[in-house]
């Protein structure tokens, strides 16, 4: 069964940027992948990021720079200041859409006792919706 | 499919200046990188300079100090500013984009060609 994982770090320099890596674990080939925070995408969530192998990238304030790392993992930073700014039990939420597997998808946020510059480690989130 | 077009070639002399220009197809979504390629008579393409959506520039040494590679206002638009043009630099330009920046898709454009001499 495909897994999605998601790591939340608190960078230790700046403490309103923050880093969210997210990955599949499966054998197909990832066609999208949608980055949001405050909850999943299209449910009261806000899409920060969309990654396209084929066609690019898509980001919104407060994301500064979303990559793909490999081609099936993905990384985001976010920087924001005042309303824009993420804070420490923001949740972030990442949804792989896959061929064959669907669309999968997990969240993840920091730790309530996470220090800046710590991260929880990037084990396979609960996987919230499989479309 | 990202389509890429090409403008600004030509003749010049050496010691001149050209300013490539590259359109891109793709407007939604950004191209994470973008860059230029050439490929002279015989020899085969190379790097010339590349450019990612955030900013970060490489150079292949022989065009350092001479070309700058930069992306426009308008989205996915990849300019080539070169100066201090030697007859070396005569080839067919291309603009090229990785939208993954894994090589998973890489697209090209058809070329513009840069003759220096005098």
């Known amino acids: 069964t495909p897994e999605v994982w998601v790591q939340v770090r608190m960078e230790a320099t700046e403490l309103s940027s923050f880093t969210i890596r997210c990955g599949f674990l499966g054998s197909g080939s990832i066609s999208l992948v949608t980055v949001s925070w405050g909850g999943p995408n299209g449910a009261g969530g806000t899409t920060l990021a969309v990654l396209h192998p084929e066609r690019g990238i898509r980001q919104w304030a407060p994301a500064r720079q979303a990559r793909w790392e490999t081609q099936s993992s993905i990384s985001l930073i976010l920087e924001g200041s005042g309303a824009s700014s993420p804070c420490a039990n923001t949740t972030f939420c990442c949804k792989f859409a896959s061929f064959p597997e669907g669309s999968w998808e997990a969240c993840g946020s920091l730790p309530p006792s996470s220090d800046p510059g710590l991260s929880a480690p990037p084990t396979p989130a609960p996987i919230l919706r499989a479309d | 499919e990202v389509q890429l077009v090409e403008s600004g070639g030509g003749l010049v002399q050496p010691g001149g200046s050209l300013r490539l220009s590259c359109a891109a197809s793709e407007t939604y979504f950004d191209l994470y990188v973008m860059g230029w390629y050439r490929q002279a008579p015989g020899k085969d393409r190379e790097l010339v300079a590349t450019i990612t959506y955030t900013g970060s520039i490489k150079y292949v040494d022989s065009v350092k100090g001479r070309f700058t590679i930069s992306r426009g206002d308008a989205k996915n638009s990849l300019y080539l500013q070169m100066n201090s043009l030697r007859a070396e630099d005569t080839a067919v330009y291309f603009c090229?984009?990785?939208?993954?920046?894994?090589?998973?898709?890489?697209?090209w454009g058809q070329g513009t060609m840069v003759t220096v001499s005098s």
């Open positions: 090229n984009a990785d939208p993954s920046g894994l090589g998973r898709k890489v697209y």
